[in-house]
Interface confidence: medium
Protein backbone atom coordinates (compact mmCIF):
# COMPACT_ATOMS: atom_id res chain seq x y z
CA UNK A 1 0.00 0.00 0.00
CA UNK A 2 1.41 3.39 -1.03
CA UNK A 3 1.65 6.18 1.51
CA UNK A 4 -0.81 9.05 1.61
CA UNK A 5 -0.66 11.65 -1.14
CA UNK A 6 0.71 15.04 -0.11
CA UNK A 7 -1.94 17.61 0.70
CA UNK A 8 -2.44 20.24 -1.98
CA UNK A 9 -2.07 23.92 -1.27
CA UNK A 10 -4.38 26.72 -2.31
CA UNK A 11 -3.73 30.41 -2.91
CA UNK A 12 -5.22 33.36 -4.76
CA UNK A 13 -3.65 35.88 -7.09
CA UNK A 14 -3.29 38.76 -6.57
CA UNK A 15 -4.69 38.07 -3.11
CA UNK A 16 -7.68 36.92 -1.11
CA UNK A 17 -9.34 40.33 -0.83
CA UNK A 18 -10.76 41.37 -4.18
CA UNK A 19 -12.90 44.39 -5.10
CA UNK A 20 -16.13 43.60 -6.96
CA UNK A 21 -15.62 43.38 -10.70
CA UNK A 22 -11.93 42.58 -10.49
CA UNK A 23 -10.45 39.28 -11.66
CA UNK A 24 -8.95 36.72 -9.32
CA UNK A 25 -7.18 33.43 -9.97
CA UNK A 26 -7.37 30.63 -7.43
CA UNK A 27 -4.31 28.43 -7.69
CA UNK A 28 -4.22 24.79 -6.56
CA UNK A 29 -0.83 23.12 -6.23
CA UNK A 30 0.16 19.53 -5.71
CA UNK A 31 2.98 17.13 -6.53
CA UNK A 32 4.19 16.36 -10.02
CA UNK A 33 1.98 13.88 -11.87
CA UNK A 34 -1.45 15.16 -10.84
CA UNK A 35 -4.09 14.12 -13.36
CA UNK A 36 -6.88 16.43 -12.25
CA UNK A 37 -7.51 19.17 -9.71
CA UNK A 38 -10.85 19.95 -8.10
CA UNK A 39 -11.79 23.29 -6.58
CA UNK A 40 -14.66 23.06 -4.09
CA UNK A 41 -16.81 25.49 -2.18
CA UNK A 42 -17.01 24.82 1.57
CA UNK A 43 -20.14 22.71 1.54
CA UNK A 44 -18.84 20.44 -1.25
CA UNK A 45 -22.08 20.97 -3.12
CA UNK A 46 -20.35 23.09 -5.77
CA UNK A 47 -17.07 22.23 -7.46
CA UNK A 48 -15.10 22.57 -10.64
CA UNK A 49 -12.72 19.99 -12.07
CA UNK A 50 -9.90 20.65 -14.49
CA UNK A 51 -7.36 18.46 -16.24
CA UNK A 52 -5.54 21.55 -17.44
CA UNK A 53 -2.59 20.95 -15.14
CA UNK A 54 0.81 22.53 -15.61
CA UNK A 55 4.16 22.01 -13.94
CA UNK A 56 4.82 24.99 -11.67
CA UNK A 57 8.31 23.90 -10.62
CA UNK A 58 10.38 20.71 -10.73
CA UNK A 59 8.45 19.41 -7.73
CA UNK A 60 4.98 20.92 -8.18
CA UNK A 61 2.06 20.87 -10.55
CA UNK A 62 -0.74 23.41 -10.49
CA UNK A 63 -4.12 24.34 -11.87
CA UNK A 64 -5.42 27.87 -12.10
CA UNK A 65 -9.11 28.70 -11.75
CA UNK A 66 -9.82 32.23 -12.95
CA UNK A 67 -12.88 34.28 -12.09
CA UNK A 68 -12.90 37.17 -14.53
CA UNK A 69 -15.21 39.46 -12.57
CA UNK A 70 -15.88 38.67 -8.94
CA UNK A 71 -19.16 39.46 -7.23
CA UNK A 72 -20.45 38.95 -3.70
CA UNK A 73 -21.59 35.48 -4.71
CA UNK A 74 -17.97 34.44 -5.24
CA UNK A 75 -17.00 35.22 -1.64
CA UNK A 76 -16.53 32.29 0.69
CA UNK A 77 -14.34 29.35 1.55
CA UNK A 78 -12.61 27.32 -1.16
CA UNK A 79 -10.41 24.26 -1.00
CA UNK A 80 -8.61 21.99 -3.44
CA UNK A 81 -7.97 18.31 -3.87
CA UNK A 82 -6.54 16.29 -6.73
CA UNK A 83 -6.43 12.90 -8.41
CA UNK A 84 -3.15 11.14 -9.04
CA UNK A 85 -3.07 7.63 -10.46
CA UNK A 86 -6.78 7.15 -9.68
CA UNK A 87 -6.30 8.12 -6.01
CA UNK A 88 -7.82 11.21 -4.41
CA UNK A 89 -5.71 13.37 -2.14
CA UNK A 90 -6.80 14.96 1.10
CA UNK A 91 -8.25 18.44 0.94
CA UNK A 92 -6.11 21.55 1.15
CA UNK A 93 -6.65 24.10 3.88
CA UNK A 94 -9.52 26.49 3.25
CA UNK A 95 -8.94 29.72 1.40
CA UNK A 96 -11.27 32.53 2.41
CA UNK A 97 -12.05 34.73 -0.60
CA UNK A 98 -13.29 38.16 0.48
CA UNK A 99 -15.09 40.45 -1.94
CA UNK A 100 -14.68 43.97 -0.61
CA UNK A 101 -15.02 47.45 -2.03
CA UNK A 102 -11.84 49.48 -2.14
CA UNK A 103 -11.40 52.15 0.46
CA UNK A 104 -11.98 55.76 -0.48
CA UNK A 105 -13.46 56.28 -3.91
CA UNK A 106 -15.49 53.36 -5.17
CA UNK A 107 -13.21 52.05 -7.82
CA UNK A 108 -14.74 48.95 -9.30
CA UNK A 109 -17.25 48.70 -12.09
CA UNK A 110 -20.79 47.45 -11.75
CA UNK A 111 -20.60 43.91 -13.06
CA UNK A 112 -22.83 41.12 -14.18
CA UNK A 113 -23.20 38.21 -11.75
CA UNK A 114 -21.92 35.57 -14.15
CA UNK A 115 -18.23 34.67 -14.28
CA UNK A 116 -15.96 31.99 -15.60
CA UNK A 117 -12.87 30.11 -14.54
CA UNK A 118 -9.99 28.42 -16.25
CA UNK A 119 -6.32 28.86 -16.95
CA UNK A 120 -5.32 32.46 -16.46
CA UNK A 121 -3.62 34.17 -19.35
CA UNK A 122 -2.70 37.67 -20.44
CA UNK A 123 -5.63 38.82 -22.56
CA UNK A 124 -5.03 40.38 -25.94
CA UNK A 125 -5.70 44.09 -26.33
CA UNK A 126 -8.78 43.25 -28.37
CA UNK A 127 -10.38 41.34 -25.51
CA UNK A 128 -9.63 43.88 -22.80
CA UNK A 129 -12.64 45.59 -21.33
CA UNK A 130 -12.46 47.07 -17.87
CA UNK A 131 -16.19 46.64 -17.37
CA UNK A 132 -16.69 43.11 -18.65
CA UNK A 133 -13.46 41.20 -19.19
CA UNK A 134 -13.66 38.52 -21.84
CA UNK A 135 -14.50 35.09 -20.45
CA UNK A 136 -11.66 32.63 -20.54
CA UNK A 137 -11.37 28.91 -19.97
CA UNK A 138 -13.84 26.57 -18.40
CA UNK A 139 -17.45 27.29 -17.58
CA UNK A 140 -17.79 27.73 -13.87
CA UNK A 141 -21.51 27.76 -13.37
CA UNK A 142 -21.40 24.74 -11.05
CA UNK A 143 -18.84 26.30 -8.77
CA UNK A 144 -19.44 30.02 -8.79
Amino acid sequence: QEGPLPRPSISAEPGTVIPPGRPVTIVCRGPVGVDQFRLEREDRSKFNDTKDVSQASPSESEARFRIDSVSEGNAGHYRCLYVKSTRWSEHSDYLDLVVKETSGDTDSPVTEPDSSAGPTQRPSDNSHNEHAPASQGLSAEHLY
Epitope: E13, G15, G104, R122, P123, D125, H128, E130, H131, P133
Partner: antibody, heavy 121, light 107 residues
Framework: EVQLVESGGGLVQPKGSLKLSCAAS????????IHWVRQAPGKGLEWVAR??????????YYADSVKDRFTISRDDSQSMVFLQMNNLKTEDTAMYYC????????????WGQGTSVTVSS | DIQMTQSPASLSASVGETVTITCRAS??????LTWYQQKQGKSPQVLVY???TLEDGVPSRFSGSESGTQYSLKINSLQPEDFGSYYC?????????FGSGTKLEIK
Protein backbone atom coordinates in the same frame (compact mmCIF):
# COMPACT_ATOMS: atom_id res chain seq x y z
CA GLU B 1 2.09 48.92 -31.81
CA VAL B 2 0.59 50.72 -28.82
CA GLN B 3 1.38 54.43 -28.88
CA LEU B 4 0.43 57.40 -26.71
CA VAL B 5 1.54 60.83 -27.91
CA GLU B 6 1.13 63.87 -25.70
CA SER B 7 0.99 67.48 -26.89
CA GLY B 8 -0.02 70.92 -25.65
CA GLY B 9 2.69 71.58 -23.12
CA GLY B 10 4.51 74.89 -22.86
CA LEU B 11 5.21 77.94 -20.74
CA VAL B 12 2.28 79.48 -18.88
CA GLN B 13 1.98 82.11 -16.16
CA PRO B 14 0.70 81.32 -12.67
CA LYS B 15 -3.11 81.27 -12.52
CA GLY B 16 -3.14 80.59 -16.26
CA SER B 17 -4.65 77.65 -18.14
CA LEU B 18 -3.38 74.96 -20.48
CA LYS B 19 -4.98 71.98 -22.20
CA LEU B 20 -2.93 68.84 -22.78
CA SER B 21 -3.89 66.27 -25.40
CA CYS B 22 -3.01 62.62 -25.76
CA ALA B 23 -3.47 60.75 -29.04
CA ALA B 24 -3.69 56.98 -28.67
CA SER B 25 -3.26 54.29 -31.30
CA UNK B 26 -2.53 50.59 -31.67
CA UNK B 27 -5.18 49.28 -29.25
CA UNK B 28 -8.92 49.24 -28.65
CA UNK B 29 -8.95 52.64 -27.03
CA UNK B 30 -12.56 52.74 -25.86
CA UNK B 31 -12.16 49.80 -23.49
CA UNK B 32 -9.20 51.18 -21.53
CA UNK B 33 -8.85 53.61 -18.66
CA ILE B 34 -6.26 56.31 -19.23
CA HIS B 35 -4.21 58.20 -16.64
CA TRP B 36 -2.11 61.32 -16.46
CA VAL B 37 1.05 61.06 -14.36
CA ARG B 38 3.51 63.91 -13.87
CA GLN B 39 7.13 64.27 -12.84
CA ALA B 40 8.60 67.55 -11.62
CA PRO B 41 12.22 68.20 -12.69
CA GLY B 42 14.53 65.93 -10.72
CA LYS B 43 11.63 64.53 -8.68
CA GLY B 44 9.55 61.37 -8.52
CA LEU B 45 6.35 60.30 -10.22
CA GLU B 46 3.03 61.76 -9.10
CA TRP B 47 -0.32 60.30 -10.10
CA VAL B 48 -2.60 63.08 -11.34
CA ALA B 49 -5.87 61.83 -12.84
CA ARG B 50 -7.70 58.88 -14.35
CA UNK B 51 -10.63 58.48 -16.69
CA UNK B 52 -12.34 55.17 -17.21
CA UNK B 53 -14.26 53.83 -20.18
CA UNK B 54 -17.82 54.37 -21.35
CA UNK B 55 -18.92 51.17 -19.60
CA UNK B 56 -18.25 52.90 -16.28
CA UNK B 57 -19.80 56.18 -17.44
CA UNK B 58 -16.38 57.74 -17.93
CA UNK B 59 -15.73 57.84 -14.18
CA UNK B 60 -12.97 60.28 -13.26
CA TYR B 61 -10.57 60.41 -10.31
CA TYR B 62 -8.06 63.08 -9.25
CA ALA B 63 -5.15 63.60 -6.91
CA ASP B 64 -5.99 65.99 -4.07
CA SER B 65 -3.31 68.39 -5.33
CA VAL B 66 -5.18 69.01 -8.60
CA LYS B 67 -8.81 68.47 -7.61
CA ASP B 68 -11.08 71.36 -8.67
CA ARG B 69 -8.35 72.74 -10.94
CA PHE B 70 -7.74 69.97 -13.47
CA THR B 71 -10.33 68.15 -15.58
CA ILE B 72 -9.68 64.92 -17.47
CA SER B 73 -11.87 64.03 -20.44
CA ARG B 74 -11.81 61.76 -23.47
CA ASP B 75 -13.12 61.49 -27.02
CA ASP B 76 -13.41 57.82 -27.97
CA SER B 77 -14.24 58.66 -31.59
CA GLN B 78 -10.83 60.31 -31.95
CA SER B 79 -8.95 58.06 -29.48
CA MET B 80 -7.98 61.16 -27.54
CA VAL B 81 -7.64 62.06 -23.86
CA PHE B 82 -7.38 65.61 -22.56
CA LEU B 83 -6.23 67.29 -19.39
CA GLN B 84 -7.61 70.78 -18.90
CA MET B 85 -5.45 72.57 -16.33
CA ASN B 86 -6.74 75.78 -14.77
CA ASN B 87 -5.43 78.09 -12.05
CA LEU B 88 -1.94 76.73 -12.60
CA LYS B 89 0.65 76.99 -9.84
CA THR B 90 4.44 76.95 -10.03
CA GLU B 91 4.40 73.52 -8.38
CA ASP B 92 2.51 72.16 -11.41
CA THR B 93 5.70 72.50 -13.43
CA ALA B 94 6.48 68.99 -14.63
CA MET B 95 6.66 66.51 -17.47
CA TYR B 96 3.13 65.17 -17.99
CA TYR B 97 2.73 61.58 -19.17
CA CYS B 98 -0.36 60.01 -20.69
CA UNK B 99 -0.54 56.37 -19.63
CA UNK B 100 -2.71 53.35 -20.38
CA UNK B 101 -4.05 51.30 -17.48
CA UNK B 102 -4.05 47.53 -17.81
CA UNK B 103 -7.08 46.74 -15.70
CA UNK B 104 -6.44 42.99 -15.64
CA UNK B 105 -2.99 43.35 -14.17
CA UNK B 106 -3.20 46.57 -12.16
CA UNK B 107 -0.36 48.36 -13.90
CA UNK B 108 0.22 51.41 -16.07
CA UNK B 109 1.58 49.41 -18.97
CA UNK B 110 2.15 51.89 -21.81
CA TRP B 111 3.49 55.41 -21.33
CA GLY B 112 3.82 58.29 -23.73
CA GLN B 113 7.05 60.25 -24.00
CA GLY B 114 5.56 63.15 -22.08
CA THR B 115 4.91 66.83 -22.67
CA SER B 116 6.62 69.52 -20.60
CA VAL B 117 4.64 72.15 -18.70
CA THR B 118 6.40 75.13 -17.12
CA VAL B 119 4.48 77.51 -14.87
CA SER B 120 6.47 80.67 -14.31
CA SER B 121 6.05 84.41 -14.35
CA ASP C 1 -5.64 57.71 1.31
CA ILE C 2 -2.93 55.07 1.12
CA GLN C 3 0.62 56.42 1.38
CA MET C 4 3.62 54.51 0.01
CA THR C 5 6.92 54.93 1.86
CA GLN C 6 9.80 53.84 -0.33
CA SER C 7 13.37 53.21 0.81
CA PRO C 8 16.18 53.80 0.34
CA ALA C 9 15.99 57.08 -1.54
CA SER C 10 19.27 56.27 -3.24
CA LEU C 11 21.49 53.26 -3.47
CA SER C 12 25.00 52.77 -4.77
CA ALA C 13 25.97 49.29 -5.89
CA SER C 14 28.35 47.45 -8.18
CA VAL C 15 27.64 45.24 -11.15
CA GLY C 16 27.05 41.69 -9.90
CA GLU C 17 25.73 42.72 -6.49
CA THR C 18 22.21 42.03 -5.19
CA VAL C 19 20.03 44.90 -4.01
CA THR C 20 16.58 45.19 -2.44
CA ILE C 21 14.21 48.15 -2.57
CA THR C 22 11.20 48.30 -0.28
CA CYS C 23 7.86 50.06 -0.19
CA ARG C 24 5.65 50.13 2.87
CA ALA C 25 1.96 50.85 2.45
CA SER C 26 0.14 52.83 5.12
CA UNK C 27 -2.75 50.37 4.88
CA UNK C 28 -3.49 46.96 3.47
CA UNK C 29 -3.23 47.07 -0.32
CA UNK C 30 -3.72 43.31 -0.75
CA UNK C 31 -0.88 42.83 -3.26
CA UNK C 32 -2.19 45.48 -5.64
CA LEU C 33 1.30 46.84 -6.18
CA THR C 34 3.33 47.51 -9.32
CA TRP C 35 7.05 48.22 -9.66
CA TYR C 36 8.43 50.45 -12.43
CA GLN C 37 11.90 51.18 -13.75
CA GLN C 38 12.76 54.57 -15.25
CA LYS C 39 15.98 55.36 -17.10
CA GLN C 40 17.28 58.92 -17.32
CA GLY C 41 15.23 60.92 -19.83
CA LYS C 42 12.87 58.02 -20.57
CA SER C 43 9.35 57.01 -19.60
CA PRO C 44 8.82 54.42 -16.85
CA GLN C 45 8.30 50.74 -17.69
CA VAL C 46 6.54 47.99 -15.76
CA LEU C 47 8.77 45.42 -14.08
CA VAL C 48 6.43 43.61 -11.68
CA TYR C 49 2.67 43.71 -11.16
CA UNK C 50 0.39 42.15 -8.54
CA UNK C 51 3.39 42.46 -6.20
CA UNK C 52 5.08 39.31 -7.47
CA THR C 53 4.36 38.73 -11.16
CA LEU C 54 7.16 39.56 -13.58
CA GLU C 55 6.10 41.50 -16.66
CA ASP C 56 6.76 39.76 -19.97
CA GLY C 57 10.32 40.29 -21.15
CA VAL C 58 11.68 41.36 -17.77
CA PRO C 59 14.81 39.39 -16.78
CA SER C 60 14.38 36.79 -14.05
CA ARG C 61 16.98 38.51 -11.88
CA PHE C 62 14.14 40.83 -10.88
CA SER C 63 11.65 39.54 -8.32
CA GLY C 64 8.89 40.97 -6.17
CA SER C 65 7.79 39.85 -2.73
CA GLU C 66 5.38 40.84 0.01
CA SER C 67 5.22 40.62 3.77
CA GLY C 68 2.16 42.21 5.29
CA THR C 69 2.14 45.81 4.11
CA GLN C 70 5.80 45.76 3.11
CA TYR C 71 6.66 45.05 -0.52
CA SER C 72 10.13 44.44 -1.89
CA LEU C 73 11.82 44.46 -5.27
CA LYS C 74 14.99 42.39 -5.39
CA ILE C 75 17.54 42.58 -8.19
CA ASN C 76 20.05 39.75 -8.26
CA SER C 77 23.40 40.09 -10.00
CA LEU C 78 23.03 43.72 -11.06
CA GLN C 79 23.72 44.45 -14.70
CA PRO C 80 24.82 47.81 -16.16
CA GLU C 81 21.38 48.32 -17.73
CA ASP C 82 19.68 48.03 -14.31
CA PHE C 83 20.90 51.40 -13.10
CA GLY C 84 18.22 54.08 -12.98
CA SER C 85 15.24 54.92 -10.81
CA TYR C 86 12.64 52.55 -9.41
CA TYR C 87 9.12 53.34 -8.22
CA CYS C 88 6.34 51.39 -6.59
CA UNK C 89 2.66 52.23 -7.09
CA UNK C 90 -0.37 50.81 -5.35
CA UNK C 91 -3.62 50.06 -7.14
CA UNK C 92 -5.86 49.35 -4.18
CA UNK C 93 -7.84 52.59 -4.16
CA UNK C 94 -7.69 56.04 -5.66
CA UNK C 95 -5.48 57.99 -5.47
CA UNK C 96 -3.06 55.42 -6.90
CA UNK C 97 -0.04 56.90 -5.18
CA PHE C 98 3.57 56.20 -6.08
CA GLY C 99 6.46 55.70 -3.73
CA SER C 100 9.01 58.51 -3.69
CA GLY C 101 11.47 56.52 -5.79
CA THR C 102 14.87 54.92 -5.40
CA LYS C 103 17.81 56.02 -7.50
CA LEU C 104 20.15 53.12 -8.15
CA GLU C 105 23.62 54.30 -9.09
CA ILE C 106 26.83 52.55 -10.09
CA LYS C 107 29.44 52.41 -7.33
Amino acid sequence: EVQLVESGGGLVQPKGSLKLSCAASGFTFNTYAIHWVRQAPGKGLEWVARIRSKSTNYATYYADSVKDRFTISRDDSQSMVFLQMNNLKTEDTAMYYCVRENWYYYALDYWGQGTSVTVSS
Amino acid sequence: DIQMTQSPASLSASVGETVTITCRASGNIHNYLTWYQQKQGKSPQVLVYNAKTLEDGVPSRFSGSESGTQYSLKINSLQPEDFGSYYCQHFWSTPFTFGSGTKLEIK
